[in-house]
Interface confidence: medium
């Protein structure tokens, strides 16, 4: 089992509001969890866009997941990984 | 299901602040979401902020922004909160809780500790 | 804010009768993921409230099963099958789907 290296980031979408990324890399077996999740509890699938899960070159795969949200609420917003029994969480950066 | 252990009662003078403290075990305190809440005597329960102990993000009642501050010690698997410029309206026993989206996807105060009694009186 | 309305206020009841405690929500409370997070809590005099129903009709571990919840929308239920003298306290529903998140004022089921 090789776990995920997480990393979240930021865009600039419409006014207002903004588009937060998870990506997911590194990791195998290929079997993955990747949602956001506002103030603990998972978003809807249809308030989320998922990538495929595909092999990076290197025997390991890597996925994302997007959502957008309002600015100045990203403290509410995290995304949840998990991964052959192991979770995590993080956070949106400043 | 794990303990959640609080401070003892406070009197506190008007325009004092209070630090309330709530310190957990027998779970992992990084993976958890903890809310405060306060109740006047005889009354209902207010929502005040919660905070997730592995980032120390935090979510607050607007009611509450200017009044409470929340902070986690993860060495100590302890949260705090600090109650500012008290008045005698903020005179209320302070709950902590712990949320549980792990277990059942969706329960937002599982477990509570024993609540903190504080008392704002000149 | 999301208000959360509780009736009756007091409801006095016999040892093993069905207690029937409504809440009413000033908003529909389904939360943008489509669960409704309504909550049931009872507190028993000097204690820290405790959890019944999670997400309007789970229970949640622990309780016993003469505690039922249902509901949509606004407007919610908590049934109580045979009241015991363990179930006497204040009740109050919570919604957890919009923040800030509500309690109702609270339903006091007491000894007839």
């Known amino acids: 089992t090789v776990p995920p290296m997480v990393n979240v980031t930021r865009s600039e979408a419409s006014e207002g509001n903004i588009t937060v990324t998870c990506r997911a890399s590194s990791f195998y077996p290929r079997n993955i969890i990747l949602t956001w999740r506002q103030d603990g509890v998972s978003l809807s699938a249809d308030t989320q866009q998922w990538g495929d899960v595909l092999p990076d070159g290197n025997g390991t795969y890597q996925t994302w997941v997007a959502t957008r949200i309002c600015r100045g609420e990203e403290q509410r917003f995290t995304c949840y990984m998990e991964h052959s029994g192991n979770h995590s969480t993080h956070p949106v950066p400043s | 299901q794990g303990q959640m252990q609080q401070s003892g009662a406070e009197l506190v003078k008007p325009g004092a602040s209070v630090k309330l403290s709530c310190k957990t075990s027998?779970?992992?305190?990084?993976?958890?979401?903890i809310s405060w809440l306060k109740q006047k005597p005889g009354q209902s329960l207010e929502w005040i902020a919660w905070?997730?102990?592995?980032?120390?993000?935090?979510s607050y009642n607007q009611k509450f922004t200017a009044k409470a501050q929340l902070t986690v010690d993860t060495s100590s698997s302890t949260a705090y909160m600090q109650f500012s410029s008290l008045t005698t309206e903020d005179s209320a026993i302070y709950y902590c809780?712990?949320?549980?989206?792990?277990?059942?996807?969706?329960?937002?105060?599982?477990?509570w500790g024993q609540g903190t009694l504080v008392t704002v009186s000149a | 804010d999301v208000l959360m309305t509780q009736t009756p206020l007091s409801l006095p009841v016999s040892l093993g009768d069905q207690a029937s405690l409504s809440c009413r929500s000033s908003q529909n409370i389904v939360h943008i993921n489509g669960n409704t997070y309504l909550e049931w809590y009872l507190q028993k005099p000097g204690q820290s409230p405790k959890l019944l129903i999670y997400k309007v009709s789970n229970r949640f571990s622990g309780v016993p099963d003469r505690f039922s919840g249902s509901g949509s929308g606004t407007d919610f239920t908590l049934k109580i099958s045979r009241v015991e003298a363990e179930d006497l306290g204040v009740y109050y529903c919570?919604?957890?789907?919009?923040?800030?998140?509500?309690f109702g004022g609270g339903t006091k089921v007491e000894i007839k």
């Open positions: 027998g779970f992992t305190f990084s993976d958890n979401y």
């Open positions: 919570f919604q957890g789907s919009h923040v800030p998140w509500t």
């Open positions: 809780a712990r949320h549980d989206y792990y277990g059942t996807s969706g329960a937002w105060f599982a477990y």
């Open positions: 905070i997730y102990a592995g980032t120390g993000g935090t």
